[in-house]
């Protein structure tokens, strides 16, 4: 293990100053996986601090992280992806704090992309489509997506829709006429893998048609 008291009572005895969080990304670069860690306190003096991961690795006992400004980073094929790894903050040979983490429980998917909205005049609806690199992956293939949209003038009034596919239909009558909308999407692992929401996709902006006074329907853009 990592030098903790044998009775299991001292789990909070680590130095809180060095608390950190990590996320993994599987097959982020071909068949290479990545692991990114950072201190939760941005004011930590990281000059002599290193990160090391040991256990649940293929062919090696431990790997050292590369430091990239404020984050620590590994890109490798050597994650076993089963069992817990011990991730430690070190100064020289001394471990300041460690966490036992299963890398399959801290997966952060890549952000969706190519978000677009197409208005269908005959159907009086908007078809939202987007793409995700995870359709091509072998591990984290099943995702839950969170589509969020708002009227541009409503700063914090986001409407969220969860879906497992990459296509969503928004009914015209559920949206305000002649309004500018912003829409974006993010993803989280679903089925076996666990973890965090991806970054948001770039936003897409679209305008709803005016209401046609004679029919009570919206005009196309």
């Amino acid at each position: 293990e990592s030098g903790y008291a044998q009775n299991g009572d001292l789990e909070d005895a680590e130095l809180d100053d060095y608390s950190f969080s990590c996320y993994s990304q599987l097959e982020v670069n071909g068949s290479q996986h990545s692991l990114t860690c950072a201190f939760e306190d941005p004011d930590v003096n990281i000059t002599n601090l290193e990160f090391e991961i040991c256990g649940a690795l293929v062919e090696v006992k431990c790997l050292n992280f590369r430091k990239l400004q404020e984050i620590y980073f590994i890109e490798t094929k050597k994650f076993l992806l089963i069992g817990k790894s011990n991730i430690c903050v070190k100064v020289g040979e001394k471990s300041l704090t460690c966490k036992k983490i299963d890398l399959t429980t801290i997966v952060k998917p890549e952000a969706p992309f190519d978000l677009s909205v197409v208005y269908r005049e005959g159907a009086n609806d908007f078809v939202v489509t987007f793409n995700t690199s995870h359709l091509q992956k072998k591990y984290v293939k099943v995702l839950m997506h969170d589509v969020a949209y708002r009227q541009e003038k409503d700063e914090n009034k986001w409407t969220h829709v969860n879906l497992s596919s990459t296509k969503l239909t928004l009914l015209q009558r559920k949206l305000q006429p002649a309004a500018m909308y912003e829409i974006k999407v993010r993803s989280i692992p679903d089925h076996y893998f666990k973890g965090f929401w991806s970054e948001w996709s770039p936003s897409y902006y679209f305008r709803t048609p005016e209401i046609n006074n004679s029919s009570g329907e919206m005009d196309p853009i």
């Epitope: 299991g8 076993l80 089963i82 817990k84 299963d102 399959t104 429980t105 072998k138 591990y139």
Partner: antibody
Framework: QVQLVQSGAEVKKPGASVKVSCKAS????????LHWVRQAPGQGLEWMGG????????AYNQKFKGRVTMTSDRSTSTVYMELSSLRSEDTAVYYC???????????WGQGTTVTVSS | DIVLTQSPASLAVSPGQRATITCRTS??????????MHWYQQKPGQPPKLLIY???NLESGVPARFSGSGSGTDFTLTINPVEAEDTANYYC?????????FGGGTKVEIK
């Protein structure tokens, strides 16, 4: 060394409840989830559920939902499994087991025999 | 629930020979190269002991005569060469989907 020590044998009447304890030592208690697996006499192994001592989060086998409750006490590095509305089919050896990863069991307690008999 | 079927139910092997136990699952327990199948040994009156995790990874302290292989729905535990102390029941277990289920067991006896 890493150890899981369970409470002693119990004899219960049908309809009663039983609470079995499992005390962990030799490792940092919050680093590993702890699960319960039972084995009826001469039978195979059956996963009942597990608990994450760090968060208190639980996962139960649907078969036991509503009858089983798993709790943990970080101050004593102990987890508990309570099974209610006992019936004769619950007669078994109950094991606590540490999850070395998702979800295989690398350290086991010695087992607690629970006998349900009128 | 995922059903695990072990075969044979029992086998008798001479010391120094090879023992092979198979475990077939009702659906795949693999995600690409991640095989969520594990093997345990249980001797009478004792708790189970982890032998192999992730289909082929030998648990620390387990003798190298134990090995595991397989993917998808078909997995194998091999003991080669068998020793007298290997008399026990052997169980496979899947962990891809809750509830995490075990095979019915294989009783290995040494002739």
């Amino acid at each position: 060394q890493v150890q899981l020590v369970q409470s002693g044998a119990e004899v219960k009447k049908p309809g009663a409840s039983v609470k079995v304890s499992c005390k962990a030592s030799g490792y940092r208690f919050t680093d590993y989830e702890l699960h319960w697996v039972r084995q009826a006499p001469g039978q195979g192994l059956e996963w009942m559920g597990g608990i994450d001592p760090k968060t208190g989060g639980t996962a139960y086998n649907q078969k036991f939902k509503g009858r089983v409750t798993m709790t943990s006490d970080r101050s004593t590095s102990t987890v508990y499994m309570e099974l209610s509305s006992l019936r004769s089919e619950d007669t078994a050896v109950y094991y606590c087991a540490r999850s070395g990863g998702r979800w295989y069991f690398d350290v086991w307690g010695q087992g607690t025999t629970v006998t349900v008999s009128s | 629930d995922i059903v695990l079927t072990q075969s044979p139910a029992s086998l008798a092997v001479s010391p120094g020979q090879r023992a092979t136990i198979t475990c077939r699952t009702s659906e795949s327990v693999s995600i690409h190269l991640l095989h969520l199948m594990h093997w345990y040994q249980q001797k009478p009156g004792q708790p189970p002991k982890l032998l192999i995790y992730g289909a082929s990874n030998l648990e620390s302290g387990v003798p190298a005569r134990f090995s595991g292989s397989g993917s998808g729905t078909d997995f194998t535990l091999t003991i080669n060469p068998v020793e007298a102390e290997d008399t026990a029941n052997y169980y496979c277990q899947q962990s891809i989907k809750d509830p995490y289920t075990f095979g019915g067991g294989t009783k290995v006896e040494i002739k």
